[in-house]
């Protein structure tokens, strides 16, 4: 029960996280004009990964896409790549984890297969979250660097009559959405990995005891021990000899292909 809850919660948290990563990637407010000592501005600039926008005091907003690929800064391209990789990995992870959910029965899929799929999706979520966090952090670092460079420029060369006020940019809402979303995806991935341990039944370490009866020689293994410490080991209790005794696992009637819970 705890395993199912952990896996389910991990899935939901990752789903929210990936939705957030997608939202952050699409948002226009990765960087916003720094208003420092001027909270009300007639022209407000903000930029995303795909386009830059200007909102006027009139209410008119104009956005222009970055229609060049080669002319864009390498860092921006890197951030785009990281976010897209994060989304792709997250989407695949979600797809895999749906089939791995303990509460969903698909044919006669063994617990070991579900455990492996849970682990796979968990790792994918972890990498997806790390990609998003890395992408957002690279962009944030780029902003900080440019901010202090433009601040230095603002206070140089102002001796003349005409002043050119350089627009400074600070952290936009998308950065915070990205950080939180990346963190959630990461947490969700860790939860999936933890759930994987509980899904995989451990091979017990008890030695098989042989009973020499007058009939068939049968070895019995104590059944019913489902340890939860292994990561995806294929640990169904098996008969050692072809005798008449069956272990607990073998006497279970497996659901048919069309039995979904």
């Amino acid at each position: 029960m705890a395993v199912t809850a952990c896996q389910g919660l991990g899935f939901v948290v990752s789903l929210i996280g990936i939705a957030g990563i997608i939202a952050a990637t699409c948002m226009d407010q990765w960087s916003t004009q720094d208003l420092y000592n001027n909270p009300v501005t007639a022209v407000f600039n903000y930029q995303g990964l795909w386009r830059s926008c200007v909102r006027e005091s009139s209410g008119f907003t104009e956005c222009r896409g970055y229609f060049t690929l080669l002319g864009l800064p390498a860092m921006l391209q890197a951030v785009r790549a990281l976010m897209i990789v994060g989304i792709v990995l997250g989407a695949i992870g979600l797809l895999v984890s749906i089939f791995a959910l303990k509460c969903i029965r698909i044919g006669s899929m063994e617990d070991s297969a579900k455990a492996n799929m849970t682990l796979t999706s968990g790792i994918m979520f972890i990498v997806s979250g790390l990609c998003a966090i890395a992408g957002v952090s690279v962009f944030a670092n780029m902003l900080v660097t440019n901010f202090w460079m433009s601040t230095a420029n603002m206070y140089t060369g102002m001796g003349g009559m005409v002043q050119t006020v350089q627009t400074r940019y600070t952290f936009g809402a998308a950065l915070f959405v990205g950080w939180v979303a990346g963190g959630l995806t990461l947490i969700g991935g860790v939860m999936m990995c933890i759930a994987c341990r509980g899904l995989a039944p451990e091979e017990t370490n008890y030695k098989a005891v042989s009973y020499h009866a007058s009939g068939h020689s049968v070895a019995y293994k104590p059944g019913g021990f489902k340890a939860s410490t292994g990561f995806g080991s294929n640990t169904k209790n098996k008969k050692i000899y072809d005798g008449g005794a069956r272990t607990e696992d073998e006497v279970q009637s497996y659901p048919s292909k069309h039995d979904y819970v």
Epitope: Q33, F60, R64, V165
Partner: antibody, heavy 118, light 113 residues
């Protein structure tokens, strides 16, 4: 087509409060634009006073901020200007205007002349 | 505040001739975000409110004759009337539309020579 019409007393005594109202027709004051007041002293240039958004948020010219209050009444489709402690220097034609693309003013009222005199 | 300085104060031009009015701002009105200059030109005739001619330094307002054109970038701007008509006699104002408080030039009075 949006039309604006200013109204208010044409004569105000020094140290008193000037009160003007701008009525908007042909459009809603709640349309999302900022609604501005601009004045023009006789024979001189234009001076921006401030604006109000239908939500009530305002922005004033720092030179007049301490004396200016702009308010809005969405039910009447009106916005108002109050300028306190007036002097002869506040004698001007007062215009209300609506902003548009490029932070420009394509829509203006006809203007109302206010004279500050005892 | 951004100070807008217009020149000349008054200008007399013959009908059909070109009229040029200049406007200089104390700070750049260029916005790098959309590559636009936030300068506006108005025409005001006696007893009337100002009429919008040009915004974004060079974009003509709808209904404005194409003999009116705006140019310039940063801090230096020009309004040009390619062929002066009798109805163009008025006072012309430039406006800083880039930052608060919005400020206007002192005006240029255009007359017929």
């Amino acid at each position: 087509q949006v039309q604006l019409q200013e109204s208010g007393p044409g004569l105000v005594k020094p140290s008193q409060t000037l009160s003007l109202t701008c009525t908007v027709s042909g459009g809603s004051i709640s349309s999302g634009y900022n609604w501005h007041w601009i004045r023009q002293p006789p024979g001189k240039g234009l001076e921006w006073i401030g604006y109000i958004h239908y939500t009530g948020s305002t922005n004033y010219n720092p030179a007049l901020r301490s004396r200016v209050t702009i308010s809005v009444d969405t039910s009447k489709n009106q916005f108002s200007l109050k300028l306190s402690s007036v002097t002869a220097a506040d004698t001007a034609i007062y215009y209300c205007a609506r902003i548009y693309n490029g932070n420009s003013f394509p829509y203006w009222g006809q203007g109302t002349t206010v004279t500050v005199s005892s | 505040d951004i100070v807008m300085t217009q020149s000349p104060d008054s200008l007399a031009v013959s009908l059909g001739e070109r009229a040029t009015i200049n406007c200089k701002s104390s700070q750049s009105l260029f916005n790098s975000g959309n590559q636009k200059n936030y300068l506006t030109w108005y025409q005001q005739k006696p007893g009337q409110p100002p009429k919008l001619l040009i915004y974004w330094a060079s974009t003509r307002e709808s209904g404005v004759p194409d003999r009116f054109s705006g140019s310039g970038s940063g801090t230096d701007f020009t309004l040009t009337i390619s062929s002066l008509q009798a109805e163009d006699v008025a006072v012309y104002y430039c406006q800083n539309a880039y930052s608060f408080p919005y400020t206007f030039g002192g005006g240029t009075k255009l007359e017929i020579k």
